[in-house]
């Protein structure tokens, strides 16, 4: 979001009916409230970065994120018998990704059409609310998953109904928290008509200068409370997990667990480095610059960072892959265009052959419903 200069015809500074037009003159419209942007921001809004690069990234995220998270949610809900806490957190993670990704066709169209929002105020607010909601939901569910993975290593006790209920309770609390913290995004006017560019932006231009301070405080609070604190918990969980795995006994099964744990850690680290850290950092810097200087020199970086934050919807399936045995099987089979039933039948026939011949070189993967490393 950049700060728009509000030229209000309402007689009150910095607020007015942006979409309202009083009459048409020639080929243009007479606007009741006009917002002006600086030249650099205008060049970003009309340049290749926002009209070509962003739609490409969002298309990739949509094409990869929708089926993979859709399949993950289906696996966790209907193909995983034991609903371990990890499964519950991953199901929520997949749901958060889906709720964000389903709106991407509108986002893609918006950027392709030169950052011109034609779908109305309400849809813009929903898109933005879900966009940020997904990012903060992902951080929190990833934190829960990371802490839970560490807890499993420290306390390798069997699955209990109580643990699952706690995980469900925590998940509901997270959804409620995210709903509450994203309320300002639904309340604030997000669509702004820019007469100079003849476009209506969605979230890319800040409608009211009076909101600049509020937006800075809002994103700073989120960065501290819903990014830094969970990031610290996640990092702590993985550092402790690595220590535990280093000191544990070294059999073949432990080695497999360790490798998968390391892959999970690398994936989560990549997610933080690519998706969460740049976006949260630049949200704060960007709004600080607008608040203090009236314009942001990091606008292009901020746009790219927010765009990259959506890649978490593509990276999350890798987390499911390293944590869930069931998802791993379904993902492998989906990529090989085979059904799990066919694979199970193959395994049954292979097992029977193995027993009849007594000496078989076949080794097939198990299709147990266990959801651990």
């Amino acid at each position: 979001t950049i700060q728009g200069t509000n030229r209000s015809s309402k007689g009150r500074s910095l607020i007015g009916k942006v979409d309202g037009t009083s009459h048409v003159t020639g080929k243009g419209v007479t606007v009741e409230t006009v917002f002006s942007v600086d030249e650099f921001s205008a060049s970003v809004l009309t340049g290749k970065l926002t009209t070509v690069f962003l739609p490409i990234v969002y298309t990739i995220v949509f094409v990869v994120g929708l089926p993979s998270n859709g399949m993950a949610l289906w696996v966790f809900l209907f193909r995983t018998k034991k609903k371990h806490p990890a499964v519950i957190y991953m199901a929520n993670l997949a749901l958060a990704d889906l709720l964000s990704v389903i709106w991407f066709p509108l986002k893609i169209a918006y950027h392709i059409h030169g950052n011109n929002w034609i779908y109305g105020e309400a849809l813009c607010n929903v898109l933005i609310g879900f966009f940020y909601g997904n990012m903060y939901c992902s951080i929190l569910f990833m934190t829960c998953l990371s802490v839970q993975r560490y807890w499993v290593i420290v306390n390798p006790m069997g699955h209990s109904r109580k643990k699952a209920n706690i995980a469900i309770g925590i998940s509901l609390a997270i959804w409620l928290l995210i709903l509450l913290v994203t309320i300002p995004l639904y309340v604030v006017k997000q669509t702004i008509f820019i007469p100079a560019l003849n476009i209506t932006t969605c979230h890319d231009v800040l409608p009211e200068q009076l909101l600049v301070g509020d937006m800075f405080n809002y994103f700073l609070s989120l960065a501290i409370g819903v990014f830094l604190f969970p990031a610290f918990l996640t990092a702590s969980a993985y550092v402790l997990m690595i220590r535990m795995l280093r000191s544990s006994a070294m059999d073949e099964n432990s080695e497999k667990k360790r490798k998968r744990a390391i892959k999970l850690i690398v994936t989560v680290l990549a997610m933080y480095l690519i998706c969460f850290t740049p976006s949260n950092l630049l949200l704060v810097v960007h709004y600080f610059l607008i608040k203090s200087q009236g314009q942001s020199h990091v606008y292009a970086l901020y746009i790219v960072a927010l765009c990259l934050s959506t890649l978490n919807s593509c990276i999350d399936p890798f987390v499911y892959y390293f944590v869930s045995h069931d998802f791993r099987d379904h993902a492998k089979n989906a990529l090989l265009c085979r059904s799990v039933r066919t694979v199970k039948q193959m395994q049954v026939s292979l097992t029977s052959k193995k027993h009849s011949r007594k000496s078989s070189s076949y080794s097939s993967s198990s299709t147990t419903v266990k959801t651990s490393y």
């Epitope: 200069t5 509000n6 030229r7 243009g28 419209v29 600086d38 030249e39 007469p195 003849n198």
Partner: antibody, heavy 119, light 106 residues
Framework: QVQLVQSGAEVKKPGSSVKVSCKAS????????ISWVRQAPGQGLEWMGV???????YYAQKFQGRVTITADESTSTAYMELSSLRSEDTAVYYC?????????????WGQGTLVTVSS | EIVLTQSPATLSLSPGERATLSCRAS??????LDWYQQKPGQAPRLLIY???SLATGIPARFSGSGSGRDFTLTISSLEPEDFAVYYC????????FGGGTKVEIK
């Protein structure tokens, strides 16, 4: 070089309308906005309205409903029409070039057109 | 609407002297303030834009400073052609002009 040449002085009766022209040269009207500013005798400057290169317009609340700004790209001319004239509208009317972005000033001005409203 | 208050209304100085003109905004306008010079019977001429940037063709004796609410136009050494009326204008929220400061020969 950049120039804004305005039409000549006008004497109008109260209740009538006046249309002031501003011919641009040295730049394209489609790439710039034209703002209109007036100055009553012995008074300060007062912003009236703007027309962007794409035809979009915006008027100061004070003049809304009375002022109409238009532009003809083929002749590189911008127009400002003020209706329902009253004696208080006696002023020098200026057109000024503006890049259309927040970080740009009114860098070139027309020579001004004196409009006298008298019965 | 943002109100700009210029002071003093009149500044009586001699050629070669330093002139300091003030412009105060009713609210924060960051650096979005321009200065114009107007001589009798002429159109305003841009001197300084965005608080401190010197416009093309303007002598270096003119300088601008300030941000937020308080701004200053300084003429380091007055030349005979500098005696005129000076206006500040904000373009942060709407376009409004100050009342003007007349710099006259003492």
């Amino acid at each position: 070089q950049v120039q804004l040449v305005q039409s000549g002085a006008e004497v109008k009766k109260p209740g009538s309308s006046v249309k002031v022209s501003c011919k641009a040269s040295g730049f394209s009207l489609s790439s710039y906005a034209i703002s209109w500013v007036r100055q009553a005798p012995g008074q300060g400057l007062e912003w009236m309205g703007v027309i962007w290169g794409n035809g979009n317009t915006y008027y100061a609340q004070k003049f809304q409903g009375r002022v109409t700004i238009t532009a003809d790209e083929s002749t590189s001319t911008a127009y400002m029409e003020l209706s329902s004239l009253r004696s208080e509208d006696t002023a020098v009317y200026y057109c000024a070039r503006w890049r259309g972005y927040k970080d740009y000033p009114f860098d070139y001005w027309g020579q001004g057109t004196l409009v006298t409203v008298s019965s | 609407e943002i109100v700009l208050t210029q002071s003093p209304a009149t500044l009586s100085l001699s050629p070669g002297e330093r002139a300091t003109l003030s412009c105060r905004a009713s609210q924060n306008i960051y650096k979005w303030l321009d200065w114009y010079q107007q001589k009798p019977g002429q159109a305003p001429r841009l001197l300084i834009y965005n608080a401190y940037s010197l416009a093309t063709g303007i002598p270096a004796r003119f300088s601008g400073s300030g941000s937020g609410r308080d701004f200053t136009l300084t003429i380091s050494s007055l030349e005979p052609e500098d005696f005129a009326v000076y206006y500040c204008q904000q373009h942060n929220s709407g376009w409004t002009f100050g009342g003007g400061t007349k710099v006259e020969i003492k």
